[in-house]
């Protein structure tokens, strides 16, 4: 059975988190998608959302967050550029499907941002520069404010897969396996 799991990313200030959430494209291709942060004991907070209906590979930029929805692949790409320590937290992608509750996607992302310059530009650190070559899109669609109370959970156990290194965004080449922590079954 599919498990809702979390994956941990340890990055330095100034680096870029570059992740993807997959979804069933037949069901959700043009649905509005959102990137949320889950703070302990609080309702998930929506930070950015795609347009409604979501447009294919059309970047939407909200501050330091860029969302890009690849309809024809069932992939939502999320980039958070120029990371700050205060960006640390638990994140998730959801699909809005009013009047039903938002549909949560796999996996949750546990982001840990630490201080300190990374030295050599990281593996994808230049994507910070790349990002601003995308014409920023001001999305006219407002992100729905409601969120399912069902998604409020206790802070899940932390993953021990601290796999990134100071000079790379994510470097798994010396890791034999990833520990994915089930949040609930």
């Amino acid at each position: 059975a599919t498990k809702l799991t979390e994956e941990k990313y340890e990055l330095k200030e100034g680096q870029t988190l570059d992740v993807k959430c997959d979804y069933t494209l037949e069901k959700f291709a043009s649905s509005q998608k959102a990137w949320q942060i889950i703070r302990d004991g609080e309702m998930p907070k929506t930070l950015a959302c795609t347009e409604r209906p979501s447009k294919n590979s059309h970047p939407v930029q909200v501050g330091r967050i860029i969302l890009e929805d690849y309809h024809d692949h069932g992939l939502l790409r999320v980039r958070m550029v120029n990371l700050q320590v205060e960006d640390s937290g638990l994140y998730q992608c959801v699909i809005y499907q009013p009047p039903k509750e938002p549909h949560m996607l796999f996996d949750r992302i546990r982001l840990v941002v630490t201080k300190g310059f990374s030295g050599t530009p990281g593996s994808n650190e230049n994507s910070t520069q790349n990002v601003y070559k995308i014409p920023p899109t001001t999305t006219k669609a407002l992100c729905p404010l409601y969120t399912s109370p069902r998604t409020v959970t206790q802070a899940p156990p932390k993953s021990t897969a601290d796999v990134s290194t100071p000079d790379s965004e994510i470097n798994l080449t010396n890791v034999t396996d990833i520990i994915r922590v089930p949040v609930f079954n």
Epitope: Y9, V19, D22, Y23, S57, L75, I170, T173, I178
Partner: antibody, heavy 123, light 107 residues
Framework: QVQLVQSGAEVKKPGASVKVSCKAS????????INWVRQATGQGLEWMGW????????GSVKKFRDRVTMTRDTSTSTAYMELSSLRSEDTAVYYC????????????????WGQGTLVTVSS | DIQMTQSPSSLSASVGDRVTITCQAS??????LNWYQQKPGKAPKLLIY???NLETGVPSRFSGSGSGTDFTFTISSLQPEDFATYYC?????????FGQGTRLEIK
């Protein structure tokens, strides 16, 4: 160590379907995406698509979209790629490949490759 | 789709030579570029990821550089086992595409 072992060579007639299997070992199968890449004899590499073994979701490039199905059996850590309505130009070696990082990472670096399955389409 | 153009398509070199292969993207791909080696009858092998990072276990004579649209793959001192075909691959967006390959032959 990580291993991807694919099913054996197949000879098919035009219009038929082929299902290639890819058995993973040496890691947690549901933790990494599986991609499929093909290579016609003497030609370059062509990416076909991806599958997340945890969610079961998959996506493929336009040219294959109506003909390819990517599935998995988590109980046996096996991924499958089925290609239908075969034509002679589908004659190629088909590779299953595991990515370098988390399923959630935008990191499409093809780190671990199966040995390849030759599919020959001939009347 | 992003087109990846490798040059040259083939080259002849001798053991000990320094060899350079270039890959040009049809638009800016930042550092989202990988390099692979493929020997006849074998699966490709990842050598360099993210334009310049050496994959674990790959000899240090292999290196990669570049950003944006122009990338370079270098073998500092060619060894007999390096004669193979080399491919670049981008992942700046979907679909992922490969270069057409560079065949490296013994002179």
């Amino acid at each position: 160590q990580v291993q991807l072992v694919q099913s054996g060579a197949e000879v098919k007639k035009p219009g038929a379907s082929v299902k290639v299997s890819c058995k993973a070992s040496g890691y947690t199968f549901t933790s990494y995406d599986i991609n499929w890449v093909r290579q016609a004899t003497g030609q370059g590499l062509e990416w076909m698509g991806w599958m997340n073994p945890n969610s079961g979701n998959s996506g493929s490039v336009k040219k294959f979209r109506d003909r390819v199905t990517m599935t998995r059996d988590t109980s046996t850590s096996t991924a499958y790629m089925e290609l239908s309505s075969l034509r002679s130009e589908d004659t190629a070696v088909y590779y299953c490949v595991r990515l370098i990082g988390y399923s959630s990472a935008w990191k499409w670096s093809f780190q671990h490759w199966g040995q390849g399955t030759l599919v020959t389409v001939s009347s | 789709d992003i087109q990846m153009t490798q040059s040259p398509s083939s080259l002849s070199a001798s053991v000990g030579d320094r060899v350079t292969i270039t890959c040009q993207a049809s638009r800016d791909i930042s550092k989202y570029l990988n390099w692979y080696q493929q020997k006849p009858g074998k699966a490709p092998k990842l050598l360099i990821y993210d334009a310049s990072n050496l994959e674990t276990g790959v000899p240090s004579r292999f290196s990669g550089s570049g950003s944006g649209t122009d990338f370079t793959f270098t073998i500092s001192s060619l060894q007999p086992e390096d004669f193979a075909t080399y491919y670049c691959q981008h992942y700046d967006n979907i679909p992922i595409t490969f270069g057409q390959g560079t065949r490296l032959e013994i002179k």
